[in-house]
């Protein structure tokens, strides 16, 4: 069961699995249900009674009934980690702790304004985990506002000390706001030879990425496949780091694989959520129960139900044996991963899905889209709703796209003479304009948030974001799509549409049925050749064919130009402006959403 | 029990030559994939040179053109052919088999499948 309140004075007995340091009692729960063994936890407090070396303690613990003796103790906060929860869950910590120096290996010392500067510097640094500022009233006259990048092997500081006049926090990477190059390729027939900072073992290349990724010290990793000549290394990921960041060492060699840590791009791609299922194929490990199940799925549902369940191995029943259920084997590890891969038993391997949530939602693969036709289907795009305004008739004003669970992101051209949010409803999950009724349950918006320096759409920053007053609940048919990673500036996108229920050509009315129109990018060097008359700035993208024939157009804008990339819709564009409909080397314009996702976080996640 | 027998360190000017010879017992040389690393004192674990099972070779920008990695699979034995010595040369090597990196800044912590021999000093003066 679900507890997410903090024990007060009190802490849990026994069932220690290690101790970390944590600035706060909240930040411990955090770290307890990012660490795969972690059910409940015990933060210790400054506090004139505790001994100084105690404060700040994160103790982890596990235990197989899911609960531990509670003993009343000063100072000693305890609590249970999230894992047991089917909230949501971030590993981002924006906050700033004053007079507190958290210790770790200090890399590197350089001047900085303030500490946000600070954050920010340790944000964009491929190695820094956390950092401690100096401010201008540190006693220490050669010290004061220095910004000190530290990195430890967890991730967490080693120490947390108090220290008057200093700041510290974390990198802000887990908060998508990193700008650091996002690398998606796996190299093929390539071994990265630098320092190994940890070794598991995975079904795949791409599970050993995603383990890379949240590992707080892997930069990037090699994979030796179940094909590599070496039996005991196959299905070896080696974690990987080096002083530059990069591989220095690039060797030749087939049935490996390498890549990159998905850090900069965790917030659009799944990275704790390995889905898949392995054939033929058994993964060891501690053994949690054994269970009859009807079929791999099955199998897979009973170990996300059980909070300790970290993977399993199904082996079919034979013939007619036990009502045709077979033996679902729930298993765990001190780290999450198998002790040991084998292939060619029969099994079907995979992992649980409770770590799924601390994904973004985003990253949920949809169902799979009719091709041809310029009609959607329900739940083709969940992400797109219309914007109705009710004054002075209820009508079909705007597209928009649903980014979080309180927020749809617009463009702000809609809202020329909307006086007031209370006007507004936004509809999610409509196919058809013709499903909306007196009855139809909507959203009302509590706010419209215009970017300040948005004057007219040509002009760019066409841009705005609606609060919502209520929150969105997701399904198949109405779920956030992805924003954008900062780091994927340099993707190209092949794979895009335009959605909305606009005009389908420039004298006409508002269509029924939600319309798509698959439509390339065009450079902004080509699109500027297209509209002299205008400035066409990095802030806009361009999309359109040559010849013309397919475009957004009246009433498609503040919808999204959507683009798949592995696998992921992002939000690329927000349709804007363009001269006519679907006209000859016309192409269609839109905001480039990229360059305003610092703005948009800044905007949803304002406390 | 894998072993790997380093041999043929020692002191030489700079500007001089040394052989570096590791014999390996108990595992199939051939298809292993080995390798030089070293270590200097105060530094981490850095690789020098790879020979892979197929013959293909691997060299540290810092030792090109002076260093040459040779096997001879018939006397389970690598080698290290190493020219024109410097002073920043001096380091204990380790000779090492089917391992893609040292652990954690060392050339002796291994991961499954790995393996490190005891290490020879080369000193060069200058």
């Known amino acids: 069961e679900c507890v997410t309140q903090l024990l007060k004075d009190t802490c849990f007995e026994g069932g220690d699995i290690t101790t970390v340091f944590t600035p706060s009692a909240k930040y411990c729960q955090v770290v307890c249900t990012y660490h795969p063994r972690c059910l409940l936890f015990t933060f210790t407090a400054e506090s004139p009674s505790e001994d100084p070396t105690r404060w700040f303690t994160c103790v982890l613990k596990d235990s197989v009934t899911e609960t531990l003796p509670r003993v009343n103790r000063t100072a000693a906060i305890s609590g249970y980690s999230f894992k047991q929860c089917s909230h949501q869950i971030s590993a981002c910590n924006k906050d700033i702790y004053v007079d507190l120096d958290m210790k770790g290996i200090n890399y590197n010392s350089s001047v900085a304004k303030s500490a946000q500067e600070c954050q920010e510097r340790c944000t964009d640094d491929v190695h820094c985990h956390f950092f401690t500022y100096a401010t201008r009233q540190f006693p220490s006259l050669e010290h004061r506002n220095i910004c000190l990048l530290k990195h430890t092997q967890t991730g967490t500081p080693t120490r947390i000390t108090k220290l008057d006049k200093v700041v510290s926090g974390f990198s802000l990477k887990s908060c998508a706001l990193s700008n650091l190059a996002c690398i998606r390729d796996i190299f093929p027939n390539t071994v990265f030879a630098d320092s190994n900072i940890d070794s598991v073992m995975a079904p795949d290349a791409f599970v050993c990425g995603r383990i890379c990724t949240h590992h707080p010290g892997c930069l990037f990793f090699t994979f030796f496949s179940q094909e590599w000549p070496k039996e005991s290394q196959r299905n070896l990921c080696l974690l990987k780091t080096s002083e530059s960041g990069l591989p220095s060492t690039r060797i030749k060699k087939s049935k490996a694989l390498s890549g990159f840590s998905l850090q900069s791009c965790r917030h659009s791609i799944p990275v704790f959520c390995h889905s898949s299922f392995y054939h033929d194929t058994d993964f060891l490990g501690e053994e949690l129960d054994i269970v009859a199940a009807k079929s791999h799925e099955a199998c897979q549902k009973l170990c996300t139900n059980a909070v300790r369940c970290q993977f399993f191995t199904y082996t079919p029943a034979q013939a007619s044996c036990n009502e045709g259920k077979g033996k679902c084997y729930l298993k765990l590890s001190s780290n999450g991963s198998p002790t040991k891969i084998l292939h060619g038993r029969g099994g079907i391997s995979g992992y649980t899905l409770r770590l799924c949530k601390m994904d973004n939602e985003c990253t949920t693969k949809i169902k799979p889209r009719i091709v041809g036709g310029t009609a959607s289907v329900r739940g083709e795009w969940p992400w797109q709703v219309t914007l109705h305004t009710t004054s002075p008739t209820q009508r079909h004003l705007c597209g928009g796209s649903i980014i979080g669970n309180q927020w749809i992101l617009t463009a702000a051209h809609c809202f020329y003479g909307v006086e007031s949010p209370k006007i507004l409803r936004v509809y999610s999950g409509i196919l058809n304009q013709s499903e909306i009724k007196e009855d139809t349950s909507f959203f009302g918006v509590q706010e419209i948030i215009i970017h300040d320096q948005y004057k007219m759409a040509e002009s760019g920053y066409d841009i705005a974001l609606l609060k919502l007053e209520t929150t969105v609940n997701y399904t198949d048919s109405q779920r956030p799509i992805c924003l954008p990673s900062k780091g994927d500036r340099n993707v190209i996108y092949t794979d895009c549409w335009v959605t909305g229920w606009g005009y389908r050509k420039l004298r006409d009315k508002i269509q029924n049925t939600l319309q798509k129109a698959k439509i390339p990018l065009v450079t902004n060097e080509e699109c500027q050749k297209r509209y002299r008359g205008h400035k066409i700035t990095h802030k806009m993208i361009c999309a359109g064919y040559r010849e013309g024939g397919k475009d957004a157009c009246k009433g498609d804008s503040g919808g999204p130009l959507s683009c798949k990339h592995n696998e992921v819709w992002h939000l690329v564009g927000i349709t804007s402006w363009g001269e006519g409909c679907a006209q000859r080397e016309r192409p269609g314009v839109y905001t480039n959403v990229v360059e305003y996702v610092d703005w948009i976080l800044e905007k949803t996640q304002a406390v | 029990q894998v072993q790997l027998v380093e041999s043929g360190g020692g002191s030489v000017q700079a500007g001089g030559s040394l052989r570096l010879s590791c014999t390996a017992s108990?595992?199939?040389?051939?298809?292993?994939?080995m390798a030089w690393y070293r270590q200097a004192p105060g530094n981490e674990c850095e690789l020098v040179s790879t020979?892979?099972?197929?013959?293909?070779?691997y060299y540290a920008d810092s030792v090109k053109g002076r260093f040459t990695i040779s096997r001879d699979n018939s006397k389970n034995t690598m080698y290290l052919q190493m020219n024109s010595l410097r002073a920043e040369d001096t380091a204990v090597y380790y000779c090492?088999?089917?391992?893609?990196?040292?652990?954690?800044?060392?050339?002796?912590?291994?991961?499954?499948?790995?393996?490190w021999g005891q290490g020879t000093l080369v000193t060069v003066s200058s």
């Open positions: 108990e595992f199939t040389f051939d298809d292993s994939d």
């Open positions: 090492a088999a089917d391992q893609w990196g040292s652990a954690e800044g060392d050339c002796t912590s291994s991961y499954p499948g790995g393996y």
């Open positions: 020979i892979t099972s197929d013959g293909g070779t």
